[in-house]
Interface confidence: low
């Protein structure tokens, strides 16, 4: 891939990280353990397709079948969860499409998130029959080990009965679990005997114990939570963005670049320019100018807004995004029409972008 002559020095990273950036999530495919999952690689004109999972090259095995543009996973398990990618290799370029697979029933420790059946777990006792706590629905407690992708919601349940009605408290790693122990706290739904943690992070890993007690006794049950963080990867740019645009002289236009990156991304908007009347340097490489980059003085770096455009603004605009692992870039073309010619449908220009890697 080519390197470029730059009008401005693009090698300097900002002193401080970008103050604001959006994260665009790839498509998520959800399957329950034991189910089969089929995903089609959404890339066109693929001569050769290769697959990865969390950065590891994925080959066929007794549960994974790769047929043409399809990936099939038979009898999915939580270990199949992760960030997948298919790369289409063509004669002139390659393109990658990313998607998430989430194989887990951990979100509800045995039921759906809405607790539609939760009232059944709240067992009222005849006031004459004094009884120590007991589990009312052990099926919902059988799965003790929960491996959950970061950012998911986790719910642990301990449906119980007793008379008088027992109280429930939660321990983390054997110690009282307090709201201040995690960012965002947690929810306890006593009538559903549940603990809910939203947007889990690696520090949430550990053993969670429900203690259910009344004056006649105490019972407890422990769940183990493992928060699986995705392996890092180079930035991913949403396909089709930035999109080609057209406007009249004096008009305004906006280019948008949607970025997905686990690591902090650095966004640059770059344009081909002329220097001393030439578009190319003595080495034959094009001159490029950095129009905008993420940094403390930059508003939303994913959007490049051009106001009162002139014919000189026409051309190719490149959104280049890098993190410490690698970089990605996509480009779009701006067509500037004379004022008397009102813009119609966006002008379709197909061109292979100059990759900056």
């Amino acid at each position: 891939r080519p390197s470029f002559s730059l009008v401005e020095d693009t090698t300097l990273e900002p002193e401080e990280p970008p103050t604001k950036y959006q994260i665009s999530q790839p498509e998520v495919y959800v399957a329950a353990p034991g189910e089969s999952l089929e995903v089609r690689c959404l890339l066109k004109d693929a001569a050769v397709i290769s697959w990865t999972k969390d950065g590891v090259h994925l080959g066929p095995n007794n549960r994974t079948v790769l047929i043409g543009e399809y990936l099939q996973i038979k009898g999915a398990t939580p270990r199949d969860s992760g960030l997948y990618a298919c790369t289409a290799s063509r004669t002139v370029d390659s393109e990658t499409w990313y998607f998430m697979v989430n194989v887990t029933d951990a979100i509800s420790s045995g039921d759906d998130e809405d607790d539609t059946d939760g009232a059944e777990d709240f067992v009222s006792e005849n006031s004459n029959n004094k009884r120590a706590p007991y589990w009312t629905n052990t099926e919902k407690m059988e799965k003790r080990l929960h491996a959950v992708p970061a950012a998911n919601t986790v719910k642990f349940r301990c449906p119980a009965g007793g008379n008088p009605m027992p109280t429930m408290r939660w321990l983390k790693n054997g110690k009282e679990f307090k709201q201040e122990h995690r960012i965002g706290g947690y929810k306890v739904r006593n009538q559903h005997w549940s603990l809910i943690m939203e947007s889990v992070v690696p520090s949430d890993k550990g053993n969670y114990t429900c203690v259910v007690e009344n004056e006649y006794g105490s019972i407890n049950h422990t769940y183990h939570l493992d928060v699986v963080e995705r392996s890092p990867h180079r930035p991913i740019l949403q396909a089709g963005l930035p999109a080609n645009a057209s406007t009249v002289v004096g008009g305004d236009v906006e280019f948008v670049c949607k970025v997905y990156s686990d690591a902090q991304p650095h966004i640059q908007w770059i344009k081909h320019v002329e220097k001393n009347g030439s578009k190319y340097g003595p080495d034959g490489l094009p001159y490029l100018k950095v129009l905008k980059h993420s940094g403390i003085n930059s508003s939303n770096a994913e959007v490049l807004a051009l106001f009162n455009v002139t014919e000189a603004d026409a051309g190719e605009y490149i959104c280049k995004v890098s993190n410490y692992i690698g970089q990605a870039n996509q480009s779009a073309w701006l067509t500037v029409l004379p004022k008397q010619q009102a813009p119609g449908r966006e002008k379709e220009i197909t061109a292979s972008p100059d990759y900056l890697e």
Partner: antibody, heavy 120, light 107 residues
């Protein structure tokens, strides 16, 4: 230049634990993974697992999953491998290796190895 | 796990010889194969990654080839410093696995 310097040889009794260190220098510690590989006397190489120092993401060989713990101290660019419930067949030279990612899982620099002897 | 089988397990050759070591995988590993060199008292050295890419600083007499399940490391003209043990390693699937090694000795 890139260097991985490991801690010295250890002699342990069966059932005990051992913790081997691997100090990295000559590169940015958080930009590469650290893998651990062992080699029993007269035997081949066996991959144990890796840790990503940036986010402490680990991945273990199932064979060792319940006994090995990989950690890092990024402030001193050091990775650690702790193996518990040692058995005599854990006698081996333990290597740390720098893993390049995501271009491919190859180990481009290795430590000198730490001999762990498990004997009663 | 993917099994990697190297052959031969040991090999005697002379300086100047052309030597070939093969590595066979129990399933297709899509060229995701590396080669390493181990000498007594020295750190293990990466020679070739992704089947045929020569690691920086490795002499051009080393080359790699193969596809599917069968891969080869070739040393075109043996030098005295090449006598060592060589290992292949697959990175097609976890856990990463190595061949049992090929010991190259002086004839």
């Amino acid at each position: 230049q890139v260097q991985l310097v490991q801690s010295g040889a250890e002699v342990k009794k069966p059932g005990a634990s051992v913790k081997v260190s691997c100090k990295a220098s000559g590169y940015t510690f958080t930009r590469y993974w650290i893998h651990w590989v062992r080699q029993a006397p007269g035997q081949g190489l066996e991959w144990m697992g890796y840790i990503n120092p940036r986010n402490v993401y680990t991945n273990y060989n199932e064979k060792f999953k319940n006994r090995v713990t990989l950690t890092v101290d990024t402030s001193i660019s050091t990775a650690y491998m702790e193996l518990s419930r040692l058995r005599s067949d854990d006698t081996a030279v333990y290597y740390c290796a720098r893993g390049d990612w995501p271009e491919g899982y190859y180990f481009d620099f290795w430590g000198q190895g730490t001999l762990v002897t498990v004997s009663s | 796990d993917i099994q990697m089988t190297q052959s031969p397990s040991s090999l005697s050759a002379s300086v100047g010889d052309r030597v070939t070591i093969t590595c066979s995988a129990s399933q297709d590993i899509n060229n995701y194969l590396n080669w390493y060199q181990q000498k007594p008292g020295k750190t293990i050295k990466l020679l070739i990654y992704y089947t045929s890419t020569l690691q920086s600083g490795v002499p051009s007499r080393f080359s790699g080839s193969g596809s599917g399940t069968d891969y080869t490391l070739t040393i075109s003209s043996l030098q005295p410093e090449d006598f060592a043990t060589y290992y292949c390693q697959q990175f097609s699937d976890l856990p990463f696995t190595f061949g049992q090694g090929t010991k190259l000795e002086i004839k």
